[in-house]
Amino acid sequence: REAAPKSYAIRDSRQMVWVLSGNSLIAAPLSRSIKPVTLHLIACRDTEFSDKEKGNMVYLGIKGKDLCLFCAEIQGKPTLQLKEKNIMDLYVEKKAQKPFLFFHNKEGSTSVFQSVSYPGWFIATSTTSGQPIFLTKERGITNNTNFYLDSVE
C-alpha cells in the first residue's frame, strides 16, 4: 500500500498556529477567523543523513498546496522557505532531498523540527503574532521551537 502523509494542525504553547500568507508561513493566534494550515508530514525512506539521536527524518508540506518547507542559506544565514513541490514527489525520490529534510524529535508531548542541512537550526515561532515562521539556533525564551501536532484527520 502506498504511503500517505500524516495530517496535523500545528500549534505552539502560546496557542499560535501556522497560517499561509501568500507564499509564506506566519504565526497567528488560534481563532475562528483564521484558517490554519494543515501540515503534511511523511518520513524519508533514504537513511543517508539519518541520526536517531536527533529524531526521524521527515519532509514537511502544506496540505492542499504543492508547497514544502525547505532550508536555504540567504546572505550567509540559514532561512526557512516554502518551495513549490509536492510532498509525495520528495517521498518517491530514492535519494534524500536534503534541503527539504527535518529531524522530527519528540520532547514530551511536543515536537521539535531541526534542519538536516543546517544542524542546530530549528523551526521556530516568535513571541509576536503575524511574524514569519523561521529558523533559529537560539532555543529559549524569545523563540518557541516546541510545537503541538494536533490530529485533524
Epitope: 494542525a9 488560534l30 481563532s31 475562528r32 514530551g108 503541538y148 494536533d150
Partner: antibody, heavy 122, light 111 residues
Framework: ELQLQESGPGLVKPSETLSLTCTVS??????????WGWIRQPPGKGLEWIGS???????YYNPSLKSRVTISVDTSKNQFSLKLSSVTAADTAVYYC??????????????WGQGTLVTVSS | ESVLTQPPSVSGAPGQRVTISCTGS?????????VHWYQQLPGTAPKLLIY???NRPSGVPDRFSGSKSGTSASLAITGLQAEDEADYYC???????????FGGGTKLTVL
C-alpha cells in the same frame, strides 16, 4: 452529551491542600484537541481561571497561582483533578471545571460543571 | 484586578437594547485572540453565550450578538427580557500570560 461533575471536600483547613476532581461523562478525556480547565469564583466576585490541562497532558497555570497549583488527568477514571496547596480564606470560592476544543470553541469553554463550594476555615 | 475590563453594571427596561463592553490589551484581544461571552444566571454555572467574537451556540437567541474591534469587544442584547437579568463575563486568551483571562463581570438589571 458531554457532562462534567465536580467533587471533593466542601471544607478545607488553612495551610492544607484543596483537592477536587472533575468526572467527565458522555465523552473521553483523551479526545483529540480537547482542553480541560478549572475556574473559580469567590462569593460575590468574578470568575478566575486557575489552570488547564489538555489532551496531550500539557498544563497551563495562572501565573498568580502557579506555585500552588497542580492539575492532572486520570485517563482510567475519565477524570481530571485540581490540587491547590497552602490555602487561605482567600481561596474560598465556588470551583468549576469546564472544557473546550482548540479548533471548535477557539480557547473558550462550552461545557461547565455545576460548581462546588469550597470553604477554607479552621 | 481583572485583565479584561468590563463595566460593573448596566441596566435597561424590557424591550430596550443594552451593550456591555470588554476592554483588553495588545497581548489578548488586540493580539487577535477571540473573545467569548458567558451568561451566569443567579445561583447557576456560567453558560457560553457567544464564542469566537460573534457566534452563538445553538439554543442561544439571536437577541444576543457579539462584536470585536481592536483591543475591545462588546456584547449587545436587544429586546431585553426579565430573564436576561444575570451576570455577563467576557473571556479571551493572553499570550504574555500563556493563559485564559476573564473580565470582572457585568451585572445586568432589567428595570
Amino acid at each position: 452529551e458531554l457532562q462534567l461533575q465536580e467533587s471533593g471536600p466542601g471544607l478545607v483547613k488553612p495551610s492544607e491542600t484543596l483537592s477536587l476532581t472533575c468526572t467527565v461523562s458522555g465523552g473521553s478525556i483523551t479526545a483529540s484537541n480537547t482542553y480541560w480547565g478549572w475556574i473559580r469564583q469567590p462569593p460575590g466576585k468574578g470568575l478566575e481561571w486557575i489552570g488547564s490541562i489538555d489532551y496531550t497532558g500539557s498544563t497551563y497555570y495562572n501565573p498568580s497561582l502557579k506555585s500552588r497549583v497542580t492539575i492532572s488527568v486520570d485517563t482510567s477514571k475519565n477524570q481530571f483533578s485540581l490540587k491547590l496547596s497552602s490555602v487561605t480564606a482567600a481561596d474560598t470560592a465556588v470551583y468549576y471545571c469546564a472544557t473546550g476544543k482548540y479548533y471548535e470553541t477557539y480557547l473558550g469553554f462550552d461545557v461547565w460543571g455545576q460548581g462546588t463550594l469550597v470553604t477554607v476555615s479552621s | 484586578e481583572s485583565v479584561l475590563t468590563q463595566p460593573p453594571s448596566v441596566s435597561g427596561a424590557p424591550g430596550q437594547r443594552v451593550t456591555i463592553s470588554c476592554t483588553g490589551s495588545s497581548s489578548n484581544i488586540g493580539a487577535h485572540y477571540d473573545v467569548h461571552w458567558y451568561q451566569q444566571l443567579p445561583g447557576t454555572a456560567p453558560k457560553l453565550l457567544i464564542y469566537g467574537n460573534d457566534n452563538r451556540p445553538s439554543g442561544v437567541p439571536d437577541r444576543f450578538s457579539g462584536s470585536k474591534s481592536g483591543t475591545s469587544a462588546s456584547l449587545a442584547i436587544t429586546g431585553l427580557q426579565a430573564e436576561d437579568e444575570a451576570d455577563y463575563y467576557c473571556q479571551s486568551y493572553d499570550y504574555s500570560l500563556s493563559g485564559y483571562v476573564f473580565g470582572g463581570g457585568t451585572k445586568l438589571t432589567v428595570l
